[in-house]
């Protein structure tokens, strides 16, 4: 069976301040079992943007029903975008365990923020 791929189709997304940003992510397999997390940045200091399992993410909603077992779309929407939200966002698949371990990352989507239209 082909190994799971994490696909972020948009290399970049530009959003006007105040609007919502949709960041697309799909996986090509249900195996291995484990959650998806979204991060801003790719190094040790990366910021957690969304965790499918737990956490507090008031501005983030999932585009599809990510809790459904057969779901392979892990796109998210971030509301009320400001210039401080600019950066590169990564969709990352984890393998279930104690603790969960990182399995594969998407290539990243760079979010840029345009000035609010007057």
């Amino acid at each position: 069976e082909e190994e799971l791929q994490v696909i972020q189709p948009d290399k970049s997304v530009s959003v006007a301040a105040g609007e919502s940003a949709i960041l697309h992510c799909t996986v090509t397999s249900l195996i291995p079992v484990g959650p998806i997390q979204w991060f801003r940045g790719a190094g040790p200091a990366r910021e957690l943007i969304y965790n499918q399992k737990e956490g507090h993410f008031p501005r983030v909603t999932t585009v599809s029903e990510s809790t459904k077992r057969e779901n392979m779309d892990f796109s998210i929407s971030i509301s009320n975008i400001t210039p401080a939200d600019a950066g590169t966002y990564y969709c990352v698949k984890f393998r279930k365990g104690s603790p969960d371990t990182e399995f594969k990352s998407g290539a990243g989507t760079e979010l840029s923020v345009r000035a609010k239209p007057s």
């Epitope: 991060f39 801003r40 040790p44 957690l48 507090h56």
Partner: antibody, heavy 117, light 108 residues
């Protein structure tokens, strides 16, 4: 408002241990990597350790094998367990939040650790 | 490992004058450089990042420039509260995080 408050500093002898704590408030602690940075008296800043949001840990060579960083997201608290302390570990230890692009945007006021015989 | 060298070690100036602080990296770091200010008995405060971008609440008399290996922090018209120690830091990839040795700006 973001607040970072360190505690646990004090005077110890070489070879002894100390555990520092940093209580965080005003932001979603579990979403950010956290660091310890130290400053010896009259000297510059030296990064000590980082713990990522997934609890992966990183250390400066000078403390590797002696210091252990950890976090308790349920208590919004960062820790630094310091073992086999040496005179050269004497410093003010700052807890610092780091952004995704490697900026130390918030710092505590620091806690002084003195290692002396 | 990148080394950041700051110069001069101490800068003696009067209020109203311009301060020019240098930070040189031992290898190119693009524009990934930040500056911090530290006053006696206080924690450092982020001033500038990505070489030129002022952090929130930082007055426009502080400006940064440079790229590659040579970077400059300029403080136009020094105010009494600007006398402090300034550190540069590379924002480049992984730990260890590296700080320069600092430049003290003191009153002449």
């Amino acid at each position: 408002d973001v607040q970072l408050v360190e505690s646990g500093g004090g005077v110890v002898r070489p070879g002894e241990s100390l555990r520092l704590s940093c209580a965080a408030s005003g932001f979603t602690f579990s979403n950010f990597a956290m660091n310890w940075v130290r400053q010896a008296p009259g000297e510059g800043l030296e990064w000590v350790s980082l713990i990522s949001v997934t609890a992966t840990t990183y250390y400066a060579d000078s403390v590797k094998g002696r210091f252990t960083i950890s976090r308790d997201n349920s208590k919004n608290t960062l820790y630094l367990q310091m073992n086999s302390l040496r005179a050269e570990d004497t410093a003010v230890y700052y807890c610092a939040k780091v952004t995704w692009n490697n900026l130390f945007d918030y710092w505590g006021l620091g806690t002084l650790v003195t290692v002396s015989s | 490992e990148i080394v950041l060298t700051q110069s001069p070690g101490t800068l003696s100036l009067s209020p109203g004058e311009r301060a020019t602080l240098s930070c040189r990296a031992s290898q190119p770091i693009d524009s990934y450089l930040a500056w911090y200010q530290q006053k006696p008995g206080q924690a450092p405060r982020l001033l500038i990042y990505n070489t030129v971008t002022r952090a929130t609440g930082i007055p426009d008399r502080f400006s940064g420039s440079g790229s590659g290996t040579d970077f400059t922090l300029t403080i136009n018209r020094l105010e009494p509260e600007d006398f402090a120690v300034y550190y540069c830091q590379h924002q480049y990839d992984w730990p260890p995080y590296i700080f320069g040795g600092g430049t003290k700006v003191e009153i002449k």
